[in-house]
Interface confidence: low
């Protein structure tokens, strides 16, 4: 009678992560008795993934009816693949015995796992930037399968072209990374612009991830000052305004000088929002000119998110 | 080590039918595109169709697209060509190639930079009646 | 669809010689390119990938470079072996899956 053989007709399999992997094992006689277990990897390291005897495997059960004194399909199906589950198979035959001993294995089966990218992760600078300076954002994803990825960075829906791209690791691995930076320029008109990150894989069936950063907690627009003199409200006063206009974020402190003594600090509140996202707002100042006796140099100071204050200053005259 | 073996080819009238076959050892063909290419006596190369078993994807070019059927066998680990309908022009040596990415990717085009690093020797198909 | 135009169509030149080949992307395409050398009966082989990337087991007298569209394969000095036919090829798609030919450049010693 012709040797026991085993027989694994699947060289490979490929599955996607969730789904169930079906490893087909046949042997060709009833003799020698004893039991199949299945492993993956080979040599002394092998991982046991079902023996037929004993053992609990939750994920794994038998393809036909392997109690049945007849039956040489020893096929399994292991449920909810995930990508640490890639790998070879190997169908091993055992003689029965005290203890049982190794008679024959498998050719083996591959099995490759397509998994979904990860949703990507887009991030910003850590601090802020101004109008016409470069920044850079990252855009992450990860736990794919296979390698095959296409990553693309769109600005308000324009395609960006600078930017570099890592597909982590470079060997096989049972899941892979992606990793890039772009560069983007920013504009005064960038408050409600978006920036994002486009990832294609087979597993998404083309409909990409995509992951998205606002520049509004990116860009800081500093602002213009203007300071003038209204025409007089009472006798002995004149309004001066300082109109600061088109910048952001909202935080903004302003100081009232009086030949260059403070006369009044204020934190922009009621502010007016432009179209473009970025705020303009007004301070007056109410000067007695008859408390002068020489002419006043009036200047209104702003700090803007914390960066160093600007100025802007205006001379009164003040008539004997 | 890397080969590929192309067989399958001869003599075949115009309206006839032939099958090539690509088997591939030395890796898992499960992991690569794998084309087809010919080049008709005297002339220079024309890719035909592609494939990745994988994932079932298919290509062809247009002088092909409805005639001929590529396939994959990945537990035989050899890809195929059907070839349908054929024509006096579609006489050429068949080669399969392997395609395979290095790892470097072209940001502003979103494609890997890859190319057919491994040939099969070829086969010769005539059409002619 | 992208065409690679390569010129010229053959070339006459001596042992030692500095070769210059050229392929023309009728659009903008990426550095997907590769060119291989075929001598008569035989199957292509690889020599440059990603336009400028030598091939193992290539001798370094073979490079490619990219300007724009125009791609090209410089043999630095001519060897007796060196004389055969020369194809570009681009990767059409992201992952390689359709890919386009040069018409060949004939190398024949002068």
């Known amino acids: 009678e012709e040797e026991l053989q085993v027989i694994q007709p699947d060289k490979s399999v490929s599955v996607a992560a969730g789904e169930s992997a079906i490893l087909h094992c046949t042997v060709t006689s009833l003799i020698p008795v004893g039991p199949i277990q299945w492993f993956r990897g080979a040599g002394p390291a092998r991982e046991l993934i079902y023996n037929q005897k004993e053992g609990h495997f939750p994920r794994v059960t038998t393809v036909s009816e392997s109690t049945k004194r007849e039956n040489m399909d020893f096929s399994i199906s292991i449920s909810n693949i995930t990508p640490a589950d890639a790998g070879t198979y190997y169908c091993v035959k055992f003689r029965k015995g005290s203890p049982d001993t190794e008679f024959k294995s498998g050719a083996g089966t591959e099995l490759s796992v397509r998994a979904k990218p990860s949703a990507p992760v887009v991030s910003g600078p850590a601090a802020r930037a101004t109008p016409q300076h470069t920044v850079s954002f990252t855009c992450e994803s990860h736990g794919f399968s296979p390698r095959d990825i296409t990553l693309k960075w769109f600005k308000n829906g324009n395609e960006l072209s600078d930017f570099q791209t890592n597909v982590d690791p470079v060997g096989e691995s049972v899941s892979y990374s992606i990793h890039s930076t772009a560069k983007v320029v920013l504009t005064r008109e960038d408050v409600h612009s978006q920036v994002i990150c486009e990832v294609a894989h087979v597993t998404l069936q083309g409909d990409p991830l995509r992951g998205t950063a606002n520049l509004s907690e990116t860009i800081r627009v500093p602002p213009t000052l203007e300071v003038t003199q209204q025409p007089v409200r009472a006798e002995n006063q004149v309004n001066v305004t300082c109109q600061v206009r088109k910048f952001y974020p909202q935080r903004l402190q302003l100081t009232w000088l009086e030949n260059g003594n403070v006369s009044r600090t204020e934190t922009a509140s009621t502010v007016t929002e432009n179209k473009d996202g970025t705020y303009n707002w007004m301070s007056w100042l109410l000067v007695n000119v008859s408390a002068h006796r020489d002419d006043v140099k009036l200047t209104c100071q702003v700090e803007h998110d914390g960066q160093p204050a600007v100025s802007k200053s205006h001379d009164l005259k003040v008539s004997a | 080590e890397v080969q590929l073996v192309e067989s399958g080819g001869g003599l075949v009238q115009p309206g006839g039918s032939l099958r090539l076959s690509c088997a591939a050892s030395g890796f898992n063909i499960s992991y690569y595109f794998i084309h087809w290419v010919r080049q008709a006596p005297g002339k220079g190369l024309e890719w035909v169709a592609s494939?990745?078993?994988?994932?079932?994807?298919?290509y062809y070019a247009d002088s092909v697209k409805g005639r001929f059927t590529i396939s994959a066998d990945t537990s035989k680990n050899t890809a195929y060509l059907q070839m349908n309908s054929l024509r006096a022009e579609d006489t050429a040596v068949y080669y399969c190639?392997?395609?395979?990415?290095?790892?470097?990717?072209?940001?502003?085009?979103?494609?890997?930079?890859?190319?057919?690093?491994?040939w099969g020797q070829g086969t010769l198909v005539t059409v002619s009646s | 669809d992208i065409q690679m135009t390569q010129s010229p169509s053959s070339l006459s030149a001596s042992v030692g010689d500095r070769v210059t080949i050229t392929c023309r992307a009728s659009q903008s395409v990426s550095s997907a390119v590769a060119w291989y050398q075929q001598k008569p009966g035989k199957a292509p082989k690889l020599l440059i990938y990603s336009a400028s990337s030598l091939y193992s087991g290539v001798p370094s007298r073979f490079s490619g470079s990219r300007s724009g569209t125009d791609f090209t394969l410089t043999i630095s000095s001519l060897q007796p072996e060196d004389f055969a036919t020369y194809y570009c090829?681009?990767?059409?798609?992201?992952?390689?899956?359709?890919?386009?030919f040069g018409q060949g450049t004939k190398v024949e010693i002068k």
């Open positions: 090829q681009q990767a059409v798609n992201w992952v390689g899956a359709l890919v386009t």
């Open positions: 494939v990745y078993s994988s994932f079932g994807y298919t």
């Open positions: 190639a392997r395609f395979t990415f290095p790892g470097l990717f072209d940001g502003f085009f979103g494609a890997y930079l890859g190319s057919l690093d491994y």
